[in-house]
């Protein structure tokens, strides 16, 4: 058993049929010695009396908020949560496996630039009785500070018969140099509680590997005289690291017809303009990627040809 | 993804082309190592990230763009000084910091060159003949060093009398290639920045 927060304890249980469970001794936080009674989850049933209460925790029915009272007055609380271990593996029931980029990916993170700011998100099908806490650091043996905000519900989606909820959190490395060469990864730890079930999830990455620039901005077309060609121009996204001559991007320009089956013409360039043939009813899209370190491409910025 | 091949203009900062070739070569070599050594811990997640130039050169600090010198997190240590007579210094107005930056890059290349050559000698003794260093990568390192043209004492190639542990050597190769790729990215950024200035 270990303390998660003040008056909140996690009992780690090997989860299998007829498991013996864990014996837990609760102590009432009071100088009083006599006339103390214990209840669970505001039940009127008295579980025991005295300054300590010994319980055998085997299942979720044994977890919950234990309260000690004296003469109708509440003295203290202890909330017991369960962390299940099945076949030597901690349970991952609360979050959904996103399976991208690989199996057992529960947390996904992205950064728009090298400032040390990043966003992580996760999915669940659970709608209520859910709370999260996020901690992060650079490295684990001698951790350097990363500050994370509160996790918030960022999207709701319908997937077949199920509703899916996306939570996200923003974190910022306390003293980040955009030009630094990372040798220690960022560690992200998410604590999750659903009802009386506790789980924790972790992710480890270098900012350079989770970079995904915003799409190029101010995408414009300029028709060239007496030609089906147009000059496409765009700018670096505002959120990209500066100076741009140091943090350079490369671009992919795509001409796509109305039908998805039509052949796509693609051009790669390091410049912020390109000349392409604009077909009728086609659209021109441009996306960006770090020029020197191949992490993710941005989403497309698009304009119609007409 | 292969990086786009840049054809340098005659007046272009002379080292940019070489640094782009360097990044392409090390990226290809790293990809080849990860494929060939698929049963070795050779991915970014599996290896220990070591920097053989740590405490010996200060490329990131010495080559910091002017715009980032206001960022206190970027200014850890800037006291290293090097020889200052490189041929990449196209402009007369080249600052002392730029010379320091380029000489730091030169020192990095020299250290990696020695490490790679020593390692290649060991890998050539491996009866499995599983992996060798790409001669193109070694040549590109050499070309960039020549373009930087700093006078520096030659570092003798390390020789080892004991029987090489080929497993350890291959893991060290992965560690070295990952680190060198990261440094090659920095070098490319620096050359791009200096070219734009």
């Amino acid at each position: 058993i270990w303390e998660l927060k003040k008056d909140v304890y996690v009992v780690e249980l090997d989860w299998y049929p007829d498991a013996p469970g864990e014996m837990v001794v609760l102590t009432c936080d009071t100088p009083e010695e006599d006339g103390i009674t214990w209840t669970l989850d505001q039940s009127s049933e008295v579980l025991g009396s005295g300054k300590t209460l010994t319980i055998q925790v085997k299942e979720f029915g044994d977890a919950g908020q234990y309260t000690c009272h004296k003469g109708g007055e509440v003295l203290s609380h202890s909330l017991l949560l369960l962390h299940k271990k099945e076949d030597g593996i901690w349970s991952t029931d609360i979050l959904k496996d996103q399976k991208e980029p690989k199996n057992k990916t529960f947390l996904r993170c992205e950064a728009k630039n090298y400032s040390g700011r990043f966003t992580c998100w996760w999915l669940t099908t659970i709608s209520t009785d859910l709370t999260f806490s996020v901690k992060s650091s650079r490295g684990s043996s001698d951790p350097q500070g990363v500050t994370c905000g509160a996790a918030t519900l960022s999207a709701e989606r319908v997937r077949g018969d199920n509703k899916e909820y996306e939570y996200s959190v923003e974190c910022q490395e306390d003293s980040a140099c955009p030009a630094a060469e990372e040798s220690l990864p960022i560690e992200v730890m998410v604590d999750a509680v659903h009802k009386l079930k506790y789980e924790n999830y972790t992710s480890s990455f270098f900012i350079r590997d989770i970079i995904k620039p915003d799409p190029p901005k101010n995408l414009q077309l300029k028709p060239l005289k007496n030609s089906r060609q147009v000059e496409v121009s765009w700018e670096y996204p505002d959120t990209w690291s500066t100076p741009h001559s140091y943090f350079s991007l490369t671009f992919c320009v795509q001409v796509q017809g109305k039908s998805k089956r039509e052949k796509k013409d693609r051009v790669f360039t390091d410049k912020t303009s390109a000349t392409v043939i604009c077909r009728k009813n086609a659209s021109i899209s441009v996306r960006a990627q770090d020029r020197y370190y191949s992490s993710s491409w941005s989403e497309w910025a698009s304009v119609p040809c007409s | 993804r292969n990086l786009p091949v840049a054809t340098p203009d005659p007046g272009m900062f002379p080292c940019l082309h070489h640094s782009q070739n360097l990044l392409r070569a090390v990226s290809n070599m790293l990809q080849k190592a990860r494929q060939t050594l698929e049963f070795y811990p050779c991915t970014s997640e599996e290896i220990d990230h070591e920097d053989i130039t740590k405490d010996k050169t200060s490329t990131v600090e010495a080559c910091l763009p002017l715009e980032l010198t206001k960022n206190e997190s970027c200014l850890n240590s800037r006291e290293t000084s090097f020889i200052t007579n490189g041929s990449c210094l196209a402009s007369r107005k080249t600052s002392f910091m730029m010379a320091l930056c380029l000489s730091s890059i030169y020192e990095d290349l020299k250290m990696y060159q020695v490490e790679f050559k020593t390692m290649n000698a060991k890998l050539l003794m491996d009866p499995k003949r599983q992996i060798f260093l790409d001669q193109n990568m070694l040549a590109v390192i050499d070309e960039l060093m020549q373009a930087l043209n700093f006078n520096s004492e030659t570092v003798p190639q390390k020789s080892s009398l004991e029987e090489p542990d080929f497993y350890k050597t291959k893991i060290k190769l992965c560690i070295l290639l990952h680190a060198f790729r990261i440094r090659a990215v920095t070098i490319d950024r620096v050359m791009s920045y200096l070219n734009a200035s």
Epitope: L4, V8, D41, Q42, L79, D129, K195, L196 | -
Partner: nanobody, 120 residues
């Protein structure tokens, strides 16, 4: 901050029925238990019924067999179905929620109360 709003109180004759509702809104986190308390004029507040996060109900002896507590998890609502009401059930009924926020810790919230009067 968790807000609780009770409704469903009113004047009813002895033997009659009422259904109280309490909706929790705001930053709820994980609810560990929901309960109904009551306070008659000049009396101490007393626990009437509670329901654990696992749905286990508990009742004060005087209401057993007459009152039923239930919870709609999806709506964060707790109900108290009161049948065979007696004059001694007259009181202000308060909703109570206890829960956990991992960022801030344990919390307890109370509703303003809804008046139940049993009289002929």
């Amino acid at each position: 901050e968790v807000q609780l709003v009770e409704s469903g109180g009113g004047l009813v004759q002895p033997g009659g029925s009422l259904r109280l509702s309490c909706v929790a809104s705001g930053s709820i986190g994980s609810i560990t238990s929901m309960a109904w308390y009551r306070q008659g004029t000049g009396k101490q507040r007393e626990l009437v019924a509670s329901i654990s996060s696992g749905g286990r109900p508990s009742y004060q002896d005087s209401v057993k067999g007459r009152f039923t507590i239930s919870r709609d998890n999806a709506e964060n609502t707790v109900y108290l179905q009161m049948n065979s009401l007696k004059p001694e059930d007259t009181a202000v009924y308060h909703c109570n929620v206890r829960g956990l926020h991992l960022d801030t810790g344990l919390y307890e919230s109370w509703g303003q109360g809804t008046q139940v009067t049993v009289s002929s």
